[in-house]
């Protein structure tokens, strides 16, 4: 007999098909022999089945010899031998109507793991794979587990369901709720204004949450709170701020928060937590504020950043246009008695500038300027 | 819920081939058959014809030589191609799904046909 | 191909009024009708199928009657939303065919 995969909630044609290319009288039965539907004369006519109501046909397909039975809204219980009596011939139709679901919400967590359960009808022996939107595969029985969801498994995971050499996709979109970047790192000069952003690497309609800024600056020698704020349907209220630093808060997302001047106190790691409605764990985002200041005391020219820098990251200091008087792979370099010009501090990477601050060394007998 | 969105060229010269395309968003494309109708303005609807998702097709007798209704099941879209347009082709178009009434319908797409 | 006629072409009528349009098959279509509502700019929208049965939505002052040929669709009580284009299709054998349609006017 013929066997035709369904997925739950879906809707299936089972086909039956005469000889005869016209309208001729057929049923359709279940493996009760309980009468689904059939036809008298061009009306449909329907049995005492349980699928009455989900049960239907094409009377445009009987005056082509096809009696197709349509069941609507697919059930797992549905799954049974269906027969076809049409021509004196019976056509039998073997449905296993399959359901895949995710375990919670589709909305999880980064680092939360993902369970798919499938449920399929009695006597039924299915293998599954899933392909995630990354191209990872994995494959299992009833189940299937993914542990530590990554922001790349955000998408539409496509599952096959193989049974009996048939097939039966299923598509599940997965959203993992992260923000865009695990860690960011802010470059500044003293006294400039500093911007963070912390968007997010999902949307919904409605986010509802509450978040807080821890900020453990290099100087301190524990962590303080700088800022707490409420997320109601995407809008930022805030409930807690500092004195010092006033930081300033985006109304909108993404997330945005403003601290007025960069200063080396300020220098150092911030974690920003995000607790969202109905959701266990939180989303996080690491931010590092970077600050570099130069200063000619006397005979003394001198630059120094503060926060977190990689041990590979080189500090200069250079006369413009010339070579760089000084480099180390240190947090302040100086230069005695320096020439008279405009000196150039520099943060590098490999080459790539990622700070600069400079200051204008005046002949001896003037005072420093700094632009 | 069931949702038909559908796109294409809204303006031919005659002799072209009007083509048109259908996403169906949600719900189940697999147990159904997939519809193109036409209106010409201030007048009544036609039929143009169907497929499914295995890609079998009953067209209107009356625009079968220059119709061909494909589909794309991996993407849920099916989409229509009428060759040889003329000004009685001018229309809106609407793809709608189909057991034996149209329903849901996709949101129209006016097709002029002017030289 | 099955004509379907609808009659009247166009009907006045006031809010509150009982409105009944008619739509024949040129031949017997037991109760493969169904009707549809248009409103100016907008998709078609099912009413009532297999002659007589509700689409899920659509308010009971809708009503559909008739099998083989001749077919009704009423409107107990007209309300201001109610005021477009009715059209009959006929379901039992193809091409799929419409009536041309009832316009329902305000008086």
């Known amino acids: 007999k013929k066997v035709v995969l369904g997925k739950k909630g879906d809707t299936v044609e089972l086909t039956c098909t005469a000889s005869q290319k016209k309208s001729i009288q057929f049923h359709w039965k279940n493996s009760n022999q309980i009468k689904i539907l059939g036809n008298q004369g061009s009306f449909l006519t329907k049995g005492p089945s349980k699928l009455n109501d989900r049960a239907d046909s094409r009377r445009s397909l009987w005056d082509q010899g096809n009696f197709p039975l349509i069941i609507k809204n697919l059930k797992i219980e549905d799954s049974d031998t269906y027969i076809c009596e049409v021509e004196d011939q019976k056509e039998e139709v073997q449905l296993l109507v399959f359901g895949l679901t995710a375990n919670s919400d589709t909305h999880l967590l980064q680092g939360q793991s993902l369970t798919l359960t499938l449920e399929s009808p009695p006597g039924s022996s299915p293998s599954v794979q899933c392909r995630s939107p990354r191209g990872k595969n994995i494959q299992g029985g009833k189940t299937l587990s993914v542990s530590q969801l990554e922001l790349q498994d955000s998408g539409t995971w496509t599952c096959t369901v193989l049974q009996n050499q048939k097939k039966v996709e299923f598509k599940i979109d997965i959203v993992v709720l992260a923000f865009q970047k695990a860690s960011s790192i802010v470059y500044k000069k003293e006294g400039e204004q500093v911007e963070f952003s912390f968007p997010l690497a999902f949307t919904v309609e409605k986010l509802t949450g509450s978040g807080e800024l821890w900020w453990q600056a290099e100087r301190a020698s524990s962590s303080k709170s700088w800022i707490t704020f409420d997320l109601k349907n995407k809008e930022v209220s805030v409930k807690r701020v500092t004195q010092d630093p006033k930081l300033q808060m985006g109304k909108k997302l993404p997330l945005h928060l403003t601290l007025p001047q960069a200063l080396p106190q300020y220098a150092g790691s911030g974690n920003l937590t995000l607790a969202l409605e109905a959701k266990t764990g939180k989303l996080h985002q690491e931010v590092n504020l970077v600050v570099m200041r130069a200063t000619q005391l006397q005979k003394n020219l001198t630059c120094e950043v503060w926060g977190p820098t990689s041990p590979k990251l080189m500090l200069s200091l250079k006369l413009e246009n010339k070579e760089a008087k000084v480099s180390k792979r240190e947090k302040a370099v100086w230069v005695l008695n320096p020439e008279a010009g405009m000196w150039q501090c520099l943060l590098s990477d490999s080459g790539q500038v990622l700070l600069e601050s400079n200051i204008k060394v005046l002949p001896t007998w003037s005072t420093p300027v700094q632009p | 819920q069931v949702q038909l969105q559908q796109w294409g060229a809204g303006l031919l010269k005659p002799s072209e081939t009007l083509s048109l395309t259908c996403a169906v968003y949600?719900?189940?494309?697999?147990?159904?058959?997939w519809s193109w109708i036409r209106q010409p303005p201030g007048k009544g609807l036609e039929w143009i014809g169907e497929?499914?998702?295995?890609?079998?097709?009953n067209y209107n007798p009356s625009l079968k030589s220059r119709v061909t209704i494909s589909v794309v099941t991996s993407k849920n879209q099916f989409s229509l191609k009428l060759s040889s347009v003329t000004a009685a082709d001018t229309a809106v178009y609407y793809c709608?799904?189909?057991?034996?009434?149209?329903?849901?319908w996709g949101q129209g797409t006016l097709v002029t046909v002017s030289s | 191909d099955i004509q379907m006629t609808q009659s009247p072409s166009s009907v006045s009528a006031s809010v509150g009024d009982r409105v009944t349009i008619t739509c024949r098959a040129s031949?017997?279509?037991?109760?493969?009708l169904a009707w549809y509502q248009q409103k100016p700019g907008k998709a078609p929208k099912l009413l009532i199928y297999?002659?007589?049965s509700f689409q899920s939505g659509v308010p009971s002052r809708f009503s559909g009657s008739g099998s083989g040929t001749d077919f009704t669709l009423t409107i107990s009580s007209l309300q201001p939303e109610d005021f477009a284009t009715y059209f009959c299709?006929?379901?039992?054998?193809?091409?799929?065919?419409f009536g041309q349609g009832t316009k329902l006017e305000i008086k």
């Open positions: 709608a799904r189909v057991l034996n009434w149209f329903d849901p």
């Open positions: 949600g719900g189940s494309f697999s147990g159904y058959y």
């Open positions: 497929i499914n998702h295995s890609g079998s097709t």
């Open positions: 031949q017997d279509i037991a109760d493969w």
């Open positions: 297999a002659a007589s």
């Open positions: 299709q006929q379901a039992n054998s193809f091409p799929y065919t």
